[in-house]
């Protein structure tokens, strides 16, 4: 006679919360005589899931009619799956015995794992801004997914990044898992308009990955380049000092004019022009009257950008010897 085989064709069954799960089990022989029971887990602590002869199993139904004499299909359907239902299910053949039935053979088992989608990835940037050529870290987090296998990729402006580290927790068996990945990005001066994207692919997403993004504008500080020029005015006794602050980001910038070390004007950048790369330019003017100056004037422009240390740029306005003579005459 043919030896009994217990066939559980699925090694793994992925089921979403609330769905029904069908656990398949067929036998190759009607002998020996005795019932087929379903258990979750192995060993003495295993949990009885279904016994046709006795017990109450309201969420379990059989796929075939087990009362038929030649039935060889012992598949069951469990309704309204919850996270507590995860585990490995075994169909087990018992041989009729007295006073008790004796376990004869077990199927290989079907692992039921919850199929849960990962949450939308959340990307967070560094706590403080950094300047171009420096490296900043971005973190991507997603949670609540199952099974554990997941793929995460990083992109900057659509180009894949390679410098990142990813962890999936917990390491062992769990109802659901979370992923955390940190990517390192080297900032370029034109990255104000750049974007980093974290892409998560999972079996539950049917090939349509989830994405989270962060703007590098939140992470970058582009310090200004400074240029000071002077132009004599038509009147002859006035000089127009032009101070150009170029290619800075973010836009919070304060400019202080000092004449021989004394503050003569403080401005906050307002009417800015925006460059194509997202940085800003600003021009400030100061009209200096040289007619009442006896000595050379040291004009200093102090720029404080985004709470950083002030940067100074000075210009010496030379008063002509003729003016010096006139000034000294005026003091007698």
């Amino acid at each position: 006679e043919e030896e009994l085989q217990m066939i559980q064709p699925e090694k793994l069954l992925l089921v979403a919360v609330g769905e029904s799960a069908t656990l398949n089990c067929t036998v190759t022989s009607l002998l020996p005589v005795g019932p087929v029971l379903w258990f979750r887990g192995v060993g003495p602590g295993r949990e009885l899931i279904y016994n046709q002869k006795e017990g109450h199993f309201p969420r379990v139904t059989t796929v075939s009619d087990l009362t038929k004499r030649n039935n060889m299909d012992f598949s069951i359907r469990i309704s309204s799956i919850t996270p507590a239902d995860a585990g490995t299910y075994y169909c087990v053949k018992f041989r009729k015995g007295s006073p008790e039935n004796v376990e004869f053979k077990s199927g290989p088992g079907t692992e039921m794992a919850l199929r849960a989608k990962p949450s939308a990835p959340v990307v967070s940037g560094p706590a403080a801004r950094a300047t171009p050529e420096h490296t900043v870290s971005f973190t991507c987090k997603s949670h609540g997914f199952s099974p554990r296998d997941i793929t995460l990729k990083w992109f900057k402006n659509g180009n894949e990044l390679s410098d990142f580290q990813t962890n999936v927790d917990p390491a062992g068996q769990s109802v659901s898992y979370s992923i955390r990945s940190t990517a390192r990005v080297v900032l370029a001066p034109w990255d104000v308009r750049s974007q980093v994207t974290c892409e998560v692919a999972h079996v539950t997403l049917q090939g349509d990955p989830l994405r989270g993004t962060a703007n590098l504008s939140e992470a970058i500080r582009v310090p200004p380049t400074l240029e000071v020029t002077q132009q004599p005015m038509r009147a002859g006794n006035q000089v127009n000092i032009t101070y150009q602050v170029r290619n800075f980001y973010p836009q919070n910038l304060q400019l202080t004019w000092l004449e021989n070390g004394n503050v003569c004007r403080t401005e906050t950048a307002s009417t800015l022009t925006e460059n194509k790369d997202g940085t800003y330019n600003w021009t400030s003017w100061l009209l200096v009257n040289t007619s009442d100056q006896r000595d050379d004037v040291v004009l200093t422009c102090q720029v404080k950008h985004d709470g950083q240390l002030a940067v100074n740029k000075s210009l010496v306005l030379e008063v002509s010897a003729h003016q010096k003579d006139q000034s000294s005459d005026a003091t007698h």
């Epitope: 034109w190 308009r193 925006e274 194509k276 997202g278």
Partner: antibody, heavy 126, light 106 residues
Framework: QVQLVQSGAEVKKPGASVKVSCKAS????????IHWVRQAPGQGLEWMGW????????NYAQKFQGRVTMTRDTSINTAYMELNRLRSDDTAVFYC???????????????????WGQGTMVTVSS | DIQMTQSPSTLSASVGDRVTITCRAS??????LAWYQQKPGKAPKLLIY???SLETGVPSRFSGSGSGTEFTLTISSLQPDDFATYYC????????FGQGTKLEIK
Amino acid sequence: QVQLVQSGAEVKKPGASVKVSCKASGYTFTGYHIHWVRQAPGQGLEWMGWINPNSGGTNYAQKFQGRVTMTRDTSINTAYMELNRLRSDDTAVFYCARERVGYCSRPSCLDDLNIWGQGTMVTVSS
Amino acid sequence: DIQMTQSPSTLSASVGDRVTITCRASQSISSWLAWYQQKPGKAPKLLIYKASSLETGVPSRFSGSGSGTEFTLTISSLQPDDFATYYCQQYDSYYTFGQGTKLEIK
């Protein structure tokens, strides 16, 4: 799909102003600069300037500075181009166009224009 | 300002012909050049960017080459749909277009 839809044709008198709209759909409006290009009848294409819909920042071609104003309304994904003090030689088709990429891949940050509106004919005549 | 000069201004050709349009820049623009096709009453359509990259959905009979100051647009086998005006555009320093080349049926 990604598209830019412009307002209808306009007839204006010399000295008047015209405001052309350009409604974006199918993509993130604030992610890409919008440019304006004009084309006089039987002539070539002339770049007028751009607007960054995210910040509202603009840059105008020297020729149009002081006469053109580009604005946007992010709540309705629409960019506008207003040209003042119209002359008869401003008679042209005005196009809005979107850049191919929404980021900078090089210092100048300039890029080609791959999505165009259908054009708005503006006729300036007394 | 960078000037762009296209030649020829008008080109007569037949279906199946191989045609070449040239664009010259007044100074080096590296590879920052695009080619557009425009039909009467329609908006320009991007064909080639970065001198030689084919825009998505554009037939492979269109190709671009060149760098620095000399650029060409080639149509390997002219189709009835290709009769139009073609413009080159530099985007190395702001934006300037060539004056256009009208491709007409011989």
